[in-house]
Interface confidence: low
């Protein structure tokens, strides 16, 4: 049976086997097309989600679809039900927390009172002044907290206590990519991880350990990517994996926070990378132990220079490394997080591509997660 399962797939009605290599090849080999059902699926970018959270204390903003203007949510009459609606609009199913925060001196959006209509937040008609003088600070999920803070050094062995959201994404029990837990059901990774194997069956996620071989594997229900854009072949290197059963969070299994929509990181901002990837370019072997390294944001203009990526780094990507080179992600780290710490840890990038590993003028290129928040929320909403 093990051999059969490894090399063949069983079609139903009528029962017959087809070679596994015929799964997800775009051709229907089973009469009801089951061979093309459990495949990496693409999901369009979709409409604008009409709520978002700002880096200014995670304050809630609401879109007026009639004018296209964003407004900050006033705390007046804001309820738990409205908090839940806001989070559901972003695709979260967990219980949110919210509090009042003072309207700051730099408040640049009009502040309006919020109501609900057809499970979407709306601005209250003829909303008067915000009497409380407070905005809504909303957290849809407790995320980005680890048991241990890493020390700032070059490259060193990492502990799962520091990075409880890091997972190993494996095909046929072999580590292929890293990934990050975003919530009990969802793991964030890179789309290019699934280029070779587009059937969902053999993909597994391993969470809760910093050693590659030692943790139980979790079944995957769905793998979702964005539709390919031939104009920008390296863009859209982002994927969401839906787990068959929700994770139980613990000290070593926790989610990382998504970035805020306005998370603009300036050059030299310190960031962290982690992974089990190759320890040497074009050689060495996959690391059995999770490694961590501190890097920094590298200016996109520098990254696109003639001696670097010559314009290949788009607005939906970001560069990180160290100016002198030598610290970088490598093969096998793909899909893992590029992380920024404010109050919590945020996944601001996904390990995507680069020329070589650790070269001074060619740092790592990362998918800019803030550019895909809308897509993530739309996928989650569709799967609620």
């Amino acid at each position: 049976k093990v051999i059969l399962d490894k090399y063949y797939f069983l079609c139903g009605q009528p029962l017959h086997f087809i070679p596994r290599k015929q799964l997800c090849d775009g051709e229907l080999d089973c009469p009801l097309g089951e061979d093309e059902e459990h495949c990496v699926k693409s999901f369009p970018e979709g409409p604008a989600v009409a709520v978002r959270l700002s880096k200014d204390r995670s304050t809630l903003q609401v879109l007026d679809s009639a004018t296209g203007n964003w407004f900050s949510a006033c705390f007046d009459n804001f309820t738990e039900a409205l908090a839940e609606t806001a989070c559901r609009q972003m695709g979260y199913s967990s219980k949110p927390t919210f509090r009042a925060v003072e309207i700051g001196p730099d408040q640049d959006l009009d502040v309006v009172e919020i109501t609900e209509n057809s499970q979407e937040l709306r601005m209250r008609n003829s909303s008067g002044p915000c009497l409380s003088g407070s905005l809504v600070s909303l957290h849809c999920l407790a995320c980005g907290k680890s048991l241990k803070t890493p020390r700032v050094v070059g490259v060193e062995e990492a502990s799962v206590d520091s990075w409880p959201w890091q997972v190993s994404i494996q095909y046929d029990k072999q580590h292929v990519c890293g990934g990050s837990i975003l919530d009990p059901h969802w793991v964030l990774t890179a789309a290019h991880c699934f280029r070779k194997h587009t059937d969902v069956f053999n993909w597994k996620v391993r969470a809760g350990s910093d050693k590659l071989g030692s943790f139980p594997s979790l079944a995957v229900a769905k793998i979702i990517i964005i539709e390919f854009n031939p104009m920008y072949p390296k863009d859209n290197d982002i994927a969401l994996m839906k787990l068959q059963f929700p994770l139980t969070f613990s000290g070593t299994v926790r989610p990382i926070c998504l970035p805020f929509f306005d998370e603009e990181l300036t050059p030299a901002t310190p960031l962290w990378i982690i992974g089990w990837g190759f320890t040497k370019q074009n050689g060495g072997k996959m690391s059995d132990i999770l490694l961590q390294a501190s890097v920094q944001v590298i200016d996109s203009t520098r990254c696109n220079a003639d001696d670097a990526y010559q314009g290949e780094v788009t607005e939906k990507m970001m560069c990180a490394g160290i100016p002198e080179g030598g610290v970088d992600t490598c093969q096998g780290d793909s899909g893992g997080p590029l992380m920024y710490q404010s109050d919590q840890w945020h996944v601001v990038g996904i390990v995507s591509w680069g020329y070589g590993c650790g070269g001074p003028s060619t740092p790592g290129v990362y998918t800019k997660v803030s550019a895909y928040l809308n897509w993530i929320y739309n996928v989650w909403k569709a799967e609620l």
Epitope: Q13, I18, P19, K21, Q22, D25, G26, E27, L28, D29, C30, P31, L32, G33
Partner: antibody, heavy 116, light 107 residues
């Protein structure tokens, strides 16, 4: 995705035979079932039969039994459909299509004209 | 052989219209039904398989439903590129048989 390329148009006399080829690329040839479907001018689609992926076993529609032969040449990744005792009502575009049950890849079609 | 009857045989519609095509099998075929689109001079293109599964790369405005003997293809908002002939096909048993086709024309 599989690409299927068919041979060119043919003009045949009634009573003769025609052999249309369909060359596959972009996948493991031995795993493909190839169906043949024809379409008379201005008419609908008609399934003629299929040749199965391994071993070359065939299944023909009753209507064409005895007149149609489907074969394959694995060395060139090509499938052939031969229709004999042609009559004027066999004038049609003949398509090869990949799949036993539904076909997501089709050849470009081969027009066979039967005329005296 | 299983007979497949499609209706209407032709229809006129405008861009943005919701279009529904029906297909009836002469005996129960469970959900072993496919829908194809064909444009003049071109090979058919698979839209829907297993009655309701959207083929990869086909726009989501196309949807299929039904089981047993009665099936429906719906185009939620007709686009200029959707003017074509649509065929249903049963894959329950050989010989595989097609419906007579529905030509969707511009009003």
């Amino acid at each position: 995705q599989v690409q299927l390329v068919q041979s060119g148009a043919e003009v045949k006399k009634p009573g003769s035979s025609v052999k249309v080829s369909c060359k596959a690329s972009g996948g493991t040839f031995s795993s493909y079932a190839i169906s043949w479907v024809r379409q008379a001018p201005g008419q609908g689609l008609e399934w003629m039969g299929r040749i199965n992926p391994s071993g070359g076993s065939t299944s023909y529609a009753q209507k064409f039994q005895g007149r149609v032969t489907m074969t394959r040449d694995t060395s060139t990744s090509t499938v052939y459909m031969e229709l004999s005792s042609l009559r004027s009502e066999d004038t049609a575009v003949y398509y090869c299509a990949r799949g036993r049950y539904s076909s997501s890849s089709w050849g470009q079609g081969t027009l066979v004209t039967v005329s005296s | 052989d299983i007979q497949m009857t499609q209706s209407p045989s032709s229809l006129s519609a405008s861009v943005g219209d919701r279009v529904t095509i029906t297909c009836r099998a002469s005996q129960s075929i469970s959900t072993y039904l496919n829908w194809y689109q064909q444009k003049p001079g071109k090979a058919p293109k698979l839209l829907i398989y297993a009655a309701s599964s959207l083929q990869r790369g086909v726009p989501s405005r196309f949807s299929g439903s039904g089981s047993g003997t009665d099936f429906t293809l719906t185009i939620s908002s007709l686009q200029p590129e959707d003017f074509a002939t649509y065929y249903c096909q049963q894959s329950y048993t050989t010989p595989l048989t097609f419906g007579g086709g529905t030509k969707v024309e511009i009003k």
